[in-house]
């Protein structure tokens, strides 16, 4: 029994941190192998992950971790049985990977904006929440080559867009990633995506159509 | 206190099969790993495999797979092993002896507790 | 699998000297995590063999402090200040690094 790709881990910085590798050989996660975690501190606990499979060979193993400070190293050590196939130490705040911005939602906005609005996934007390910049993907479902990357790099968790840069009767899906820059983290999952049809209409068809008279 | 108390000695045909008992106490059974481990007269030690009691997993040595099966009753804070096909080979005496803990650290030791033996001879 | 060899089958010892006990292996024990997983083991005259030292030079609960481990990835010494009658016994290496776990063929400390 061999380790491939040693753990790669990385975590929320609030509650969970995510480790993931691979062995030479397609691998029962649960049944072979486990994850031993203790914070590197004189009389912290030992604990167990047992992880789940990824893929064939791929294991991931989800750990509940203390609200994190960023001084703390975890110690891991992976086992076969009483084997110790690896062992490890991971930094939780140096290997951020931000939660998932949640319920992203479309309205129509006055002067034919949409207006694009998510929640941001940290609760206000927690570091990360003032540190959040995100990423929105909006892309034509029909059309993979008409799409739009958006980065916001202001506070709230919105976007307006306007109705105009998107091209008229067609079904659109924007999704949402975020990151730390401040803790260089990795981007965070995309959101699901939300769908709406864009139906703005050129501002040229929007002009009253008046017969126009000539006053001499 | 920790203690491993081992069945008493058998003395058994050429082709029958044998099961030999470890009992704990003094410890959370469920906790460590069980080795056993043969030692042939006058010889050295030889790793049979290992059990992790609170789901059965087991490891062998590739040279006893087949000849030896390894099982707990949780109940009884018990572990078995069971020797089949038996020869002249298989007379030696088999020890139990606790392993690490499931909960360890890379800190470990092991084989910190040994149960007193169990002496099988094979003999028509 | 990884071959423990202990070249010495007995070493001869006076009581109150100190003996030194060779062990080798096929692959190097020192584990990325700079722990060797070496022990030694006692079995004494008529009984279950005893750990002595884990960890190559982790001295076991209970075991007197005149018993010592050193050595590096491959070659290890199990050393005995002021030997006792009641050391008497076969020594025995063992590697923790990889299944099967394997012992040396052990050494008997004999009283001169």
């Known amino acids: 029994v061999k380790v491939l790709h040693e753990p790669s881990c990385f975590s929320d910085y609030i509650s969970t941190s995510v480790c993931q590798w691979k062995m030479d050989h397609p691998t029962n996660c649960s049944a072979e192998l486990r994850l031993s975690y203790q914070l590197d501190f004189m009389g912290s606990e030992n604990h167990t992950c047992v992880p789940e499979n990824r893929e064939d060979s791929v294991c991931v193993c989800s750990m509940p971790i203390d609200d994190a400070v960023e001084a703390d190293v975890y110690q891991l050590d992976l086992w076969a049985g009483q084997q110790l196939l690896w062992s490890g130490s991971f930094q939780p705040s140096k290997h951020v990977k931000p939660r998932t911005p949640g319920n992203l939602t479309v309205h129509p906005n006055i002067s034919h904006t949409w207006l694009l609005m998510w929640t941001n996934p940290y609760p206000t007390e927690n570091h990360l929440h003032s540190e959040l910049t995100y990423m929105v993907n909006v892309s034509n479902d029909n059309d993979p080559e008409d799409f739009k990357v958006y980065n916001v790099t202001y506070m709230g968790p919105t976007l307006r867009l306007a109705a105009s840069t998107l091209k008229s009767g067609a079904s659109y899906s924007a999704r949402v990633r975020a990151w730390a820059q401040t803790y260089n983290s990795t981007w965070s999952d995309w959101s699901p995506s939300t769908t709406w049809l864009n139906y703005y209409e050129p501002w040229e068809q929007h002009l009253p159509h008046h017969h126009h008279h000539h006053h001499h | 206190e920790v203690q491993l108390q081992q069945s008493g000695p058998e003395l058994v045909k050429p082709g029958a099969s044998v099961k030999i008992s470890c009992k704990a106490s003094g410890y959370t059974f469920t906790d460590y790993y069980m080795n056993w481990v043969k030692q042939s007269h006058g010889k050295s030690l030889e790793w049979i495999g290992d059990i992790i009691p609170s789901n059965g997993g087991t490891s062998y040595n590739q040279k006893f797979k087949g000849k030896a099966t390894l099982t707990v009753d949780k109940s009884s804070s018990a572990a078995y092993m069971e020797l089949r096909s038996l020869t002249s080979e298989d007379s030696a005496v088999y020890y139990c002896a606790r392993g690490i803990s499931y909960y360890g650290n890379r800190y470990y030791f092991t084989m910190d507790y040994w149960g007193q033996g169990t002496s099988v001879t094979v003999s028509s | 699998d990884i071959v423990m060899t202990q070249a010495a089958p007995s070493v001869p010892v006076t009581p109150g000297e100190s003996v030194s006990i060779s062990c080798r292996s096929s692959k190097s024990l020192l584990h990325s995590n700079g722990n060797t997983y070496l022990f030694w083991f006692v079995q004494r005259p008529g009984q279950s063999p005893q750990l002595l030292i884990y960890?190559?030079?982790n001295l076991a609960s209970g075991v007197p402090d005149r018993f010592s481990g050193s050595g590096s990835g491959t070659a290890f010494t199990l050393r005995i200040s002021r030997v006792e009658a009641e050391d008497v016994g076969v020594y025995y290496c063992m590697q923790h690094l990889e299944y099967p776990f394997t012992f040396g063929s052990g050494t008997k400390l004999d009283i001169k």
């Open positions: 960890r190559m030079s």
